[in-house]
Structure formats: C-alpha cells, structure tokens
C-alpha cells in the first residue's frame, strides 16, 4: 500500500560534512516496526546510503559502521548524514516502509537536495 | 506502569450477547494493537484476532468470524469484545493483550460463563 | 493457518535440572522484514499468561537470564537452565508473523 513521505526541498551541510533532515511519514497507527532507508540519487543511479529498523518499544539503531545516525519520535525520523564532501551533493530521498504489523506500506519523500561546500583549506602561517 | 484491566464475569444464556471491556492506562492507547485470546476451561490459548486501535480495523481468525466483533472507545482508551448469539462452546475466559511486536501486557481475564 | 506444535506435552522435572521445550511450525515464520515472530509465554495457574522471550531469543524485561531462546525458520527451542518453583505452569509458543497468528499447544512443566 502507498504513504506519502516528506522532506525538506534543500539542506545546506555543514563545513564539518554533517547535513541533518526531518523525514516525516503518514501516521503510522499502529505500526510497530518501521524500516526507514535514505537514497542517494545521481542521474539515473539510485545506492543505498545506510537503513535502519526501529520498533515501538525501541529506538532507531543504524549499523554501529553506518554514516547515518538518526532518532525517531512518532511518525518522525531525524536523519543526519556524516562524512560528506563536495562529491556527495546530491538528491537524498528518504524511503519509509511499515513493516509490522500487516498491512505493509511503503513511502518515500521527493528527496532532499543537499549542498555540501568543501571548506577551503587554512592557509599556512609564517 | 502498564495496566489493562478487563471487566468482570459474566453468567449469560445461550443466544444472549456479551460485551466485555479492557480499559488501558500507562501509554499510548494509539501506538500498540489490541489483541483478544480466549481459553476454555482446561484448554490452551487461542488468538482470536486483534484491533488496530488508531483506524479501528479489525482482525478476525477465521473460527472467529461471524459472531464476534471488536470496538473501540478511543477516548477511555478502552477496546471491546462482543460475542453474539451466544453458545456453550463460548464458555472460556478471554484476555486481552497489548502488541507492538510481542504481547507484553495482559488483561487479568475475563470469564464468560453460558448456561441455560 | 500455520499450525505450532509442541514437545513435549508434559515436562516432569527436578528443580535444579534444565528444561528444553520444542515448538515446530507446520511452515516458515520469517516475517518480510526479515524479523521472526516467535515469542514464548508462560501462563500459571488462575493467572494471565506472561512474556518470557519474543522475536526468537530476545528476553523480556525481567525476565531471569536462566531462560533463554533459540532457533529459525520452523525449529525453535526454549531452555529453562536451572528450573525454580516458580517456573511450574504450562509454557506457550506463539508465531505472530503471519495471519492469522497462531499459539503452540502448550507444554506442562511440572515437579517430577
């Protein structure tokens, strides 16, 4: 079954290559173990950046090795990305699905557009 | 904490109705499923569906099918089993149990006794 | 229906002894996020049943270490390692992964 997902349009990283996004989905009900996965597409590309399952009793948990950490709260998911460089703006679509209980649904966001601005490199002092 | 407690027992007649209540408190009635098992007297427990206590749609196991119906009372964060026309076969006690992914919480029972 | 069947029907034992109770399922309960909803319940007399471990071998919270879960796809074990008075009563698999969810026959454990 489809569910709309949101995102915001545009996030600009920090020069520390750290970019954070709300990933907002349909009201969950009763959802109980919700599988949010973030995407990153390049032209007609589309990898997997990192995913994660939380459940209604525990919190979301991304791959100890993940560049992904995140919370959730509701139908909420706080994304932050890590380790970003200039090389790695792109459009970051966030895909939602509620796995448990039946029915199954699926939803992913527009995707967010996220600028990342390698910072200039200091200049050596005298 | 967590609590569910159901109504008292019941001493009904073969084609009567019942209707038996399990009020939540502790959390978010909205956030976890209701689910109903019943037990006969000396017998094992047997999952007789469960209601989605934010859309109110329920799920009926096919022996379940017909005569039961689960409701909600959102507000009271209470749900409801009613067990139409009535049998001797009804005879049972019936729980209610919250879940997420797993039944964590239980109502105390309810018994349902059909005589005539 | 997907039909859990339980060994033994009784378990007498000595307190102190390990238990292990075996719960089949007629096919596999590997949900599709890959998560399998297998939970095991131990209901005492004149009581309601209580958790004691769920998605195959995780414990519920305050559940004692001395219990423990094991298993996949159709074969699952719940072992009891050092049995205690108060772990008498008749223990229940139960599959929750799919509809309708379905619980075991039940196994009585019991003072030998």
């Known amino acids: 079954k489809g569910m709309h997902a949101a995102q915001p349009a545009v996030v600009l990283a920090s020069s520390r290559g750290v970019a954070s996004f709300v990933c907002e989905y349909g009201s969950s009900g009763n959802a109980a173990e919700v599988r949010v996965t973030m995407l990153r597409q390049a032209g007609s590309q589309m990898t997997e950046v990192c995913a994660a399952t939380y459940t209604v009793e525990d919190e979301l948990a991304f791959l100890d090795d993940s560049t992904c950490t995140g919370t959730s709260s509701g139908n909420k998911v706080n994304l932050t990305i890590q380790g970003l460089r200039a090389m790695g703006t792109g459009l970051y679509i966030c895909k939602v699905e509620l796995m448990y209980p039946p029915p199954y649904y699926v939803g992913m966001g527009n995707g967010t557009q996220i600028y990342v601005i390698d910072p200039e490199p200091c200049p050596d002092s005298d | 904490q967590i609590q569910l407690v159901q109504s008292g027992p019941e001493l009904k007649k073969p084609g009567e109705t019942v209707k038996i209540s399990c009020k939540a408190s502790?959390?978010?009635?909205?956030?976890?499923?209701m689910n109903w098992v019943k037990q006969a007297p000396g017998k094992g427990l047997k999952w007789m569906g469960w209601i989605n206590t934010y859309t109110g749609e329920p799920t009926y196991a096919d022996d379940f099918k017909g005569r039961v119906a689960f409701s909600l009372e959102t507000s009271a964060s209470t749900a409801f089993l009613q067990i139409n026309n009535l049998k001797n076969e009804d005879t049972a006690t019936y729980f209610c149990a919250r879940r997420g992914v797993r039944l964590d919480y239980w109502g105390q029972g309810t018994t349902l006794t059909v005589s005539s | 229906d997907v039909l859990m069947t339980q060994t033994p029907l009784s378990l007498p034992v000595s307190l102190g002894d390990q238990a292990s109770i075996s719960c089949r399922s007629s096919?596999?309960?590997?949900?599709?996020?890959?998560?399998?909803?297998l939970e095991w319940y131990l209901q005492k007399p004149g009581q309601s049943p209580k958790l004691l471990i769920y998605?195959?071998?995780s414990r519920f919270s305050g559940v004692p270490d001395r219990f423990s879960g094991s298993g996949s796809g159709t074969d699952f074990t719940l072992k009891i390692s050092r049995v205690e008075a108060e772990d008498l009563g008749v223990y229940y698999c139960?599959?929750?992964?799919?509809?309708?969810?379905?619980f075991g026959g039940g196994t009585k454990l019991e003072i030998k």
């Open positions: 502790g959390y978010t009635f909205t956030n976890y499923g």
């Open positions: 139960f599959q929750g992964s799919h509809v309708p969810w379905t």
């Open positions: 998605k195959v071998s």
């Open positions: 096919q596999s309960i590997v949900y599709i996020s890959g998560s399998t909803y």
